[in-house]
């Protein structure tokens, strides 16, 4: 079947990285610079994605595969194929329309992206706060007071990192 198909369509013999050149008697020509074909039998090569400005080349274009972009330092990718670059914030902040803002009391963000989220409410699980929350870190829940048998030494919480808060009880 392959032999029959190639007799009928010489273009099917053209491998990835080439195109079937109608201007040259349908011979397989290499893709021109800044273009690629990822499959065989192509009649044209596709233009490569160009990473410019805030977009940075993560993977160079080759004759058989497209370039891939990510974002310059201080930004992170959003959208299909990194179609947007969103500004990073510091841990303990979230991005608003007016730029990076500190998390409100009772919320935290441990990443450079995303929104501030409420501290865990330990009491909902019948537990107590072992380590207080900060803008950058969630509270750490410990065993409930009832779980500590009489005479057992209670856990001393480590010093909070910065601006300690208290989980809403």
């Amino acid at each position: 079947f392959e032999r029959t198909r190639s007799l009928q369509d010489p273009c099917s013999n053209c491998p990835a990285g080439t195109f079937c050149d109608n201007n040259r008697n349908q011979i397989c020509s290499p893709c021109p610079p800044n273009s690629f074909s990822s499959a065989g039998g192509q009649r044209t090569c596709d233009i490569c994605r160009q990473c410019k400005g805030v977009f940075r080349t993560r993977k160079e274009c080759s004759s058989t595969s497209n370039a891939e972009c990510d974002c310059t330092p201080g930004f992170h990718c959003l959208g299909a194929g990194c179609s947007m670059c969103e500004q990073d914030c510091k841990q303990g902040q979230e991005l608003t329309k007016k730029g990076c803002k500190d998390c409100c009391f009772g919320t935290f963000n441990d990443q450079k992206r995303g929104i501030c989220r409420p501290w865990t409410n330990c009491s909902l699980d019948g537990k107590s706060v072992l380590v207080n929350g900060t803008k950058e870190r969630d509270v750490v829940c410990g065993p409930s007071p009832a779980d500590l048998s009489p005479g057992a030494s209670s856990v001393t919480p480590p010093a909070p990192a910065r601006e300690p808060g208290h989980s809403p009880q």
Epitope: N34, G53, F75, S83, C85, K97
Partner: antibody, heavy 123, light 107 residues
């Protein structure tokens, strides 16, 4: 508030040159990731990208104009420039400068535009 | 260069109508496509970026969809201020290119 104000348009002789300015306010041309470009529109026609310049100083040009165009900037004045040489009648257009990217999300879209300046190439 | 072909070139519609404009790219451009509105004598205004993200301050009746080669701008209920020319623009590679425009006129 981001503002872009173009100046320098007017009547130019064929074969001459033009130098347009674009004064930016509300942001810095040297802010990381930010690009500013020039786009033109011939009377009654569509939009044509001329080129752009980024915070790093790297420039990109439309190949159809590359041999005649230079985009530059003066960070101290927060001003962008477009130099176009060997002018011909078909360069008659409104020339816009525009900032790429939105407030905190950047990419090659033009979110802020100047009012445009008309350049007429005629003898 | 990547060519963008808009259709229709012009259309007549009434206030309240749902209007759809399409933009076809000469090859796949993923989601690297933007939409603008331009009124006579004014600079273009960004409506949609990255195929489907609504620019801040743009009414929610505008929406964008599509990826690859076929993209759509939809105005869910046309308002008097929406009569204008609309352009798509790709940023997959340079030169950045625009569609030829679609003029939306009053029926």
């Amino acid at each position: 508030e981001v503002q872009l104000v173009e100046s320098g348009g007017g009547l130019v002789q064929p074969g001459g040159s033009l130098r347009l300015s674009c004064a930016a306010s509300g942001f810095s041309l040297s802010t990381s990731g930010v690009g500013v470009g020039w786009i033109r529109q011939a009377p009654g026609k569509g939009l044509e990208w001329i080129g752009d310049i980024y915070h790093s100083g790297s420039t990109y040009y439309n190949p159809s104009l590359k041999s005649r165009v230079t985009i530059s900037r003066d960070n101290s004045k927060n001003t962008l420039y477009l130099q176009l040489n060997s002018l011909r009648a078909e360069d008659t257009a409104v020339y816009y400068c525009a900032r790429e990217g939105s407030t905190a999300v950047l990419g090659d879209w033009f979110a802020y535009w100047g009012q445009g300046t008309l350049v007429t190439v005629s003898s | 260069d990547i060519q963008l072909t808009q259709s229709p070139s012009s259309l007549s519609a009434s206030v309240g109508d749902r209007v759809t404009i399409t933009c076809r790219a000469s090859q796949s451009i993923s989601s690297y496509l933007n939409w603008y509105q331009q009124k006579p004598g004014k600079a273009p205004k960004l409506l949609i970026y990255a195929a489907s993200t609504l620019q801040s301050g743009v009414p929610s009746r505008f929406s964008g969809s599509g990826s690859g080669t076929d993209f759509t701008l939809t105005i869910s209920s046309l308002q008097p201020e929406d009569f204008a020319t609309y352009y798509c623009q790709q940023y997959y590679s340079t030169p950045l290119t625009f569609g030829q425009g679609t003029k939306v006129e009053i029926k």
